[in-house]
């Protein structure tokens, strides 16, 4: 039961995380105009990965797409790439994890296959989360660098009369969404990897213990017939009757008349 819960929770957390990564990637507020000592501005600038926007005091908002690839900074291109890779890996991970979920039964899929799929999706989520965190962090670093550069020459005097105020940009909401979403995807991936360990069938269900009887040298394996069939280690053996109650996590996936409803 704990494994199913861990796997399910990992899936949900990753799903939320990937939705957040997608949202962050699409958001326009990656960087917003720093208002420093002026909280009310007549013209407010903010920028995303795909377009830059201006919101006027009048309420009018105008957004312009970056209609160039070569003219964009390499760092911005790198951030875009990281976020897209994160989304793609996350989406594939979600697809894989759906089939890996213990609560969903697909044909005669064995637990070992589900365990492998869970591990695969977990790794994909981890990499996806790391890509998002890396992308957001690279952009944040770029902002910090530019912020201090523009602060250094914020007022450039022209003959001592005319001032040109350089627009400074600070962290936008998308950065925080991206960091949180990346973290959630990462956590979800770790949970999936943990669930994988619980899903993977052990080599043998019972450890062999040697008993030295007087006069005879016989190795006794507890579990009788069950052990001799290798039920725990070889799932390809024919199904044997076991009347004992099992927890959901112990149930093996065997085809039955209920599997193809």
């Amino acid at each position: 039961m704990a494994v199913t819960a861990c796997q399910g929770l990992g899936f949900v957390v990753s799903l939320i995380g990937i939705a957040g990564i997608i949202a962050a990637t699409c958001m326009d507020q990656w960087s917003t105009q720093d208002l420093y000592n002026n909280p009310v501005t007549a013209v407010f600038n903010y920028q995303g990965l795909w377009r830059s926007c201006v919101r006027e005091s009048s309420g009018f908002t105008e957004c312009r797409g970056y209609f160039t690839l070569l003219g964009l900074p390499a760092m911005l291109q790198a951030v875009r790439a990281l976020m897209i890779v994160g989304i793609v890996l996350g989406a594939i991970g979600l697809l894989v994890s759906i089939f890996a979920l213990k609560c969903i039964r697909i044909g005669s899929m064995e637990d070992s296959a589900k365990a492998n799929m869970t591990l695969t999706s977990g790794i994909m989520f981890i990499v996806s989360g790391l890509c998002a965190i890396a992308g957001v962090s690279v952009f944040a670093n770029m902002l910090v660098t530019n912020f201090w550069m523009s602060t250094a020459n914020m007022y450039t005097g022209m003959g001592g009369m005319v001032q040109t105020v350089q627009t400074r940009y600070t962290f936008g909401a998308a950065l925080f969404v991206g960091w949180v979403a990346g973290g959630l995807t990462l956590i979800g991936g770790v949970m999936m990897c943990i669930a994988c360990r619980g899903l993977a069938p052990e080599e043998t269900n019972y450890k062999a213990v040697s008993y030295h009887a007087s006069g005879h040298s016989v190795a006794y394996k507890p579990g009788g017939f069950k052990a001799s069939t290798g039920f725990g280690s070889n799932t390809k053996n024919k199904k044997i009757y076991d009347g004992g109650a099992r927890t959901e996590d112990e149930v093996q996936s065997y085809p039955s008349k209920h599997d193809y409803v």
């Epitope: 009018f60 001032q163 105020v165």
Partner: antibody
Framework: QVQLQESGPGLVKPSQTLSLTCTVS?????????WHWIRQPPGKGLEWIGY???????NYNPALRSRVTISVDTSKNQFSLKLSSVTAADTAVYYC???????????WGQGTTVTVSS | DIVMTQSPDSLAYSLGERATINCKSS????????????LTWYQQKPGQPPKLLIY???TRESGVPDRFSGSGSGTDIFITISSLQAEDVAVYYC?????????FGGGTKLEIK
């Protein structure tokens, strides 16, 4: 077409409070725009006083901030200006206006002349 | 506050002539975010409220004759009347629309010679 009309007393005594109201017709004051007050002393240029949004958020000219209060009454489709401790320097034509693209003012009231005199 | 300086205070041109009014700001009105200059031009006739002519320094308001055009960038912006008409006699004001408080130029009175 949005129309604005200022109303209020034409004569105010020094040190008293000037009160003006702008009635908006042909559109709702809750449309999301900022509604402004601008004044023009006789024979001089224009001076921006401040604005109000229908939500009640305001922004005033720092030169007048300590004396200005702009309020809104969405039910009456009106917004008002109060200027306290007036002096002869506050004698002007007071306009209400609505902002639009480029932070420009395409819609103005006809203006109301306010004279500060004892 | 951004100081708007208009020059000259008054101008006289003959009908049909090209008239140009200059507006200088103490700070650049150019916004890099949308590559626009936040300067507005108004025309005011006696006893009337100002009438919007041009916003974003060069965008003509609907209904404004095409003889009116705006140009310039940053701190020096102009309004040009390509062929002066009798009805263009008025006072012209420029407005800083870039930052609060909004400020206006002192006005330029345009007259017929």
């Amino acid at each position: 077409q949005v129309q604005l009309q200022e109303s209020g007393p034409g004569l105010v005594k020094p040190s008293q409070t000037l009160s003006l109201t702008c009635t908006v017709s042909g559109g709702s004051i809750s449309s999301g725009y900022n509604w402004h007050w601008i004044r023009q002393p006789p024979g001089k240029g224009l001076e921006w006083i401040g604005y109000i949004h229908y939500t009640g958020s305001t922004n005033y000219n720092p030169a007048l901030r300590s004396r200005v209060t702009i309020s809104v009454d969405t039910s009456k489709n009106q917004f008002s200006l109060k200027l306290s401790s007036v002096t002869a320097a506050d004698t002007a034509v007071y306009y209400c206006a609505r902002i639009y693209n480029g932070n420009s003012f395409p819609y103005w009231g006809q203006g109301t002349t306010v004279t500060v005199s004892s | 506050d951004i100081v708007m300086t208009q020059s000259p205070d008054s101008l006289a041109y003959s009908l049909g002539e090209r008239a140009t009014i200059n507006c200088k700001s103490s700070q650049s009105l150019f916004n890099s975010g949308n590559q626009k200059n936040y300067l507005t031009w108004y025309q005011q006739k006696p006893g009337q409220p100002p009438k919007l002519l041009i916003y974003w320094a060069s965008t003509r308001e609907s209904g404004v004759p095409d003889r009116f055009s705006g140009s310039g960038s940053g701190t020096d912006i102009f309004i040009t009347i390509s062929s002066l008409q009798a009805e263009d006699v008025a006072v012209y004001y420029c407005q800083n629309a870039y930052s609060f408080p909004y400020t206006f130029g002192g006005g330029t009175k345009l007259e017929i010679k």
